[in-house]
């Protein structure tokens, strides 16, 4: 039993540096505790952007200082990443882990390419 994770191929961040995408997983079992992690892949380096563990039916709780927020509905997680700048353009991978009850399952999406364009500074008005 494999766990498939789906996410959009491309997302364009808003002019305010906010990007949202859906991460959907096909659960092989009846998980009550799920961990969702957003990873950023740059070249061959993979780093954690944010992570949240949630009980099915409850809201995702990211750490207070996290740049991510999210909501869950069944096997679907709506993720929002804030504070993005042009230099943050890259591949963002959704990783899902079914933590409880056993058995543990791992699922990794193919990644969402998030494009971030810094807004042009407003010209001074005389």
């Amino acid at each position: 039993k494999a766990m498939h994770v789906a996410q959009p191929a491309v997302v364009l961040a808003s002019s305010r540096g906010i990007a949202s995408f859906v991460c959907e997983y096909a659960s092989p079992g009846k998980a009550t505790e799920v961990r969702v992690t957003v990873l950023r892949q740059a070249d061959s380096q993979v780093t954690e952007v944010c992570a949240a563990t949630y009980m099915m039916g409850n809201e995702l709780t990211f750490l207070d200082d996290s740049i991510c927020t999210g909501t869950s509905s069944g096997n679907q997680v709506n993720l929002t990443i804030q504070g993005l700048r042009a230099m943050d353009t890259g591949l963002y991978i959704c990783k899902v882990e079914l933590m409880y009850p056993p058995p543990y399952y791992l699922g990794i999406g193919n990644g969402t390419q998030i494009y971030v364009i810094d807004p042009e500074p407003c010209p001074d008005s005389d």
Partner: antibody, heavy 118, light 106 residues
């Protein structure tokens, strides 16, 4: 750089207990799942146990379930394996390994040898 | 439990030759890794996700396969490649390893 250093191994009699430690450095310990893997002399690798992130979720191999307990102290960046009711077949080199961001065991310690013998 | 069976048990080859190692799973595997272990050393991650090379691994190492059949290929054996190689599945618990393939100098 990432470093994992095990300690606590030694020679112990069957039925006795031993506690292994794995000191981690060079990464944010609480963000990673941590595994124990063992290797009997001249044999292959055998997964023993894993503990996830905040320490609430743990899984064990059937061969050690009920006898071994995995734990972690994120404030000390240390992983533990409490081994009770030891048997001759538990004799092995015990290594800790980090579960990388994408799942595989990307860093391993050199291991600590446990010998169970009367 | 997913059982991984590696073949052959031992592979006798000369430096410069191509090595092909097989790993077969008892049921479909979603995530597979390959490790290299030299005597007295800890295992080293070579390949993850069946075909992605780990950081710092030379491109003579390549992985392929899906489902139940996986292959590790070393295109041209270097003296330092003679070691034991293990496959591992990490997509579900319990985590399991193959019994290993020893690549020795002919």
């Amino acid at each position: 750089q990432v470093q994992l250093v095990e300690s606590g191994g030694g020679v112990v009699q069957p039925g006795r207990s031993l506690r292994l430690s794995c000191a981690a450095s060079g990464f944010t310990f609480s963000r990673y799942g941590m595994h124990w893997v063992r290797q009997a002399p001249g044999k292959g690798l055998e997964w023993v146990a894993v503990i996830w992130y905040d320490g609430r979720n743990k899984y064990y191999a059937d061969s050690v379930k009920g006898r071994f307990t995995i734990s972690r102290d994120n404030s000390k960046n240390t992983l533990y394996l409490q081994m009770n009711s030891l048997r001759a077949e538990d004799t092995a080199l015990y290594s800790c390994a980090r579960a990388g961001e994408l799942g595989p065991f990307d860093y391993w310690g050199q291991g600590t040898l446990v010998t169970v013998s009367s | 439990e997913i059982v991984l069976t590696q073949s052959p048990g031992t592979l006798s080859l000369s430096p410069g030759e191509r090595a092909t190692l097989s790993c077969r799973a008892s049921q479909s595997v979603s995530y597979l890794a390959w490790y290299q272990q030299k005597p007295g050393q800890a295992p080293r991650l070579l390949i993850y996700g069946a075909s992605s090379r780990a950081t710092g691994i030379p491109d003579r190492f390549s992985g392929s396969g899906s489902g139940t059949d996986f292959t590790l290929t070393i295109s041209r054996l270097e003296p330092e490649d003679f070691a034991v190689y293990y496959c591992q599945q990490y997509g579900s618990s319990p985590w399991t390893f193959g019994q290993g393939t020893k690549v020795e100098i002919k």
